[in-house]
């Protein structure tokens, strides 16, 4: 999990569409029990907003201690505040849990800016608005941290949902979701619907607002419209995918597709922004500026620093372009595209101007660690993390913010050749991926 524009955050070669339809969600295949349908008890179980993360309520220990936990697909540790901290309303008190077991091992997780460290143990964990199961899971009890917890975010820990390869201190520490699948009959799949507000929320509204849904063990059809399109998980560490083409308002950026995935492309609910490799970011911003050239914005806006404000209700969405990312499909030489609106990549910021104004930050930023499809991308889509079949599905979210003229889209198939060449092969080193 990279800090900076990461949560805790810290707050990025298509062709003509085919005439024939290629398979996407293969409806004719037998379904696993519980894989499809309705998961009423899990719908609306997330709260928060893109700038400070989405969290789910969890209980830890015996008797159960309730905590709000950030949902992070960009890391693999379950870590919770376990000592007093000025930004925490509550924390995990191991001494009060009769089922806590100490692993007698420490863990230290540094970020580009900030860090957390703690003590490893295991305890009983459940998700009240999740599957009706309790699992014994590894827990990092955070005893010290710097620039990790966010004042007013309302979460006290982090649920790393990625794979063991990037777990700390090493890949022998089983991540929570692996423990859940091993110890129960929950299918090896989860799905996320993150619902961006589209307008600023004040503190009381955030606490009262619904942020979306984490469906554990399945797919809820009520959370999306249209079809689910799947892209392969390239490697099971982060949720790594391959982008094969990028368009701004339908105009191809025309870069070598390796640049889009340099040095990787990941789907990460714990990052606020769409983060793009330097060259791609520069080309994208140039293209977005050109598309919106009837108005000019300050340099600091494009750096994600200055906020641009419009009189409430007058944000000129129409001058900003749509952004399309083409992802490798499941079928040879087939891709599909996901398209986001300015309503996703202009992030509303609360508590800065008067109620007469709507103010926004540009939520696309530069990365030195590859493309990160963060909350601003995910807020447009229902995203299925199908670990069992090593693939990630995208469909248009039923809660995405749009206007009467444009909507987010997931479309395909498109013919795209040599997509394997778009992946970047990272040289193997012992260096920490978290420190880049």
């Amino acid at each position: 999990t990279q800090h900076g524009i990461r949560l805790p955050l810290r707050s990025g070669l298509g062709g003509a569409p085919l005439g024939l339809r290629l398979p996407r969600e293969t409806d004719e295949e037998p379904e696993e029990p519980g894989r499809r349908g309705s998961f009423v008890e899990m719908v609306d179980n997330l709260r928060g907003k893109s700038g400070q993360g989405y969290y789910v309520e969890m209980t830890v220990g015996s008797p159960p201690q309730t905590l709000n936990i950030l949902v992070d697909t960009g890391s693999s540790n379950f870590a919770v505040g376990a000592a007093p901290h000025p930004f925490l309303h509550r924390y995990y008190q191991r001494q009060l849990s009769s089922t806590y077991r100490d692993l007698r091992k420490g863990v230290y997780v540094p970020y580009t800016q900030g860090k957390w460290e703690g003590e490893l143990g295991t305890d009983l964990v459940s998700i009240p608005h999740g599957p009706n199961v309790t699992v014994r899971a590894n827990i990092a009890a955070i005893t010290e941290s710097d620039k990790f917890f966010i004042n007013g975010s309302n979460w006290e820990g982090i649920l790393g949902l990625a794979y063991a390869e990037i777990a700390r201190p090493d890949d022998s520490l089983e991540p929570f979701f692996d423990s859940l699948v091993k110890q129960t009959h929950v299918p090896n799949l989860f799905s996320l619907q993150l619902c961006g507000a589209g307008f600023p929320l004040n503190q009381s509204e955030v606490l009262a607002s619904v942020g979306g849904s984490m469906i554990i063990g399945g797919i809820d059809h009520s959370l999306y419209t249209g079809s689910l399109w799947y892209t392969p998980i390239r490697r099971e560490w982060y949720y790594e995918v391959i982008i094969v083409r990028v368009e701004i308002n339908g105009q191809d950026l025309k870069m070598d597709c390796k640049e889009y995935n340099y040095d990787k492309s990941i789907v990460d609910s714990g990052t606020t922004n769409l983060r793009l490799p330097k060259k791609v970011f520069e080309a994208a911003v140039k293209s977005i500026k050109a598309a919106s050239s009837t108005e000019k914005f300050p340099d600091g806006f494009w750096l994600g620093e200055q906020l641009v404000c419009w009189q409430a209700g007058t944000t000129p969405w129409n001058i900003f372009p749509v952004i399309s990312l083409y992802l490798m499909g499941e079928v040879t030489n087939q891709s599909f595209r996901i398209t986001i609106l300015p309503q996703q990549y202009l992030r509303p910021v609360e508590d800065v101007a008067t109620s007469q104004d709507d103010c926004y930050k540009f939520a696309i930023s530069q990365s030195s660690t590859g493309t990160v499809m963060g909350a601003v991308i995910m807020e447009g889509f229902y995203v299925v993390f199908d670990r069992a079949r090593k693939r990630i599905g995208f469909a248009v979210s039923a809660c995405h913010v749009h206007d009467e003229f444009r909507t987010a889209a997931v479309e395909g198939p498109f013919v795209t050749l040599d997509m394997e060449d778009c992946g970047y092969n990272i040289p193997q080193t012992d260096e920490s991926t978290l420190m880049t």
Partner: antibody
């Protein structure tokens, strides 16, 4: 070098419309590097931003004045203008036109200002 | 709304002395802050932008510092022509709309 000069009546009656023009000389108002703005200063008081305009005609106004303000641009004359309707004595001020440079963020060049008095 | 509070309202100093002017924002404006100088009967003049960068033609005795909510304009050794009113302005929110109330630097 580039200069800005405000012009317009120094006296306006209450409820009427204040109209000022800023003439840009020594450079083009159609430069893509700048916005152009109006700021006012009541006698003995501080500065108040009124609004900005880009040569394309894109405008931004102070929310507190928006219902009464219109800023327009005439690229052929290298001028931009301010109209403030339904004026009262509280609109008596020195009105400055200025260039918004340094990444469209700071007023780096100002006109000398013109005093407009609202009185019957 | 972001409010800029300047202090002191008036600063009485002699030529050659060091002047320290403060501007405090009601919430963080990062480093998007400017300082302007205004002499009687004249238009304001940009001195400092982005909190610490001197504008073109501004003497080295003027310097700006700070980020977030607390900013300082320092005049290392006052010249007679430096006696004026100084305003800060935030541009974290764009378009720039908020000026401080001003600090008058007068001859003691």
């Amino acid at each position: 070098q580039l200069q800005l000069q405000e012009s317009g009546p120094g006296l306006v009656k209450p409820s009427e419309t204040l109209s000022l023009t800023c003439t840009v000389s020594g450079g083009s108002i159609s430069s893509s590097s700048y916005y152009w703005g109006w700021i006012r200063q009541p006698p003995g008081k501080g500065l108040e931003w009124i609004g900005n305009i880009y040569y394309s005609g894109s405008t931004y106004y102070n929310p507190s004045l928006k219902s009464r303000v219109t800023i327009s641009v005439d690229t052929s004359k290298n001028q931009f203008s301010l109209k403030l309707s339904s004026v009262t004595a509280a609109d008596t001020a020195v009105y400055y036109c200025a260039r918004l440079g340094h990444g469209y963020s700071y007023f780096d060049l100002w006109g000398r200002g013109t005093l407009v008095t609202v009185s019957s | 709304e972001i409010v800029l509070t300047q202090s002191p309202a008036t600063l009485s100093l002699s030529p050659g002395e060091r002047a320290t002017l403060s501007c405090r924002a009601s919430q963080s404006v990062s480093s998007y802050l400017a300082w302007y100088q205004q002499k009687p009967g004249q238009a304001p003049r940009l001195l400092i932008y982005d909190a610490s960068n001197r504008a073109t033609g501004i003497p080295a005795r003027f310097s700006g510092s700070g980020s977030g909510t607390d900013f300082t304009l320092t005049i290392s050794s006052l010249e007679p022509e430096d006696f004026a009113v100084y305003y800060c302005q935030q541009v974290y929110l764009w378009p720039p709309r908020t000026f401080g109330g001003g600090t008058k630097v007068e001859i003691k």
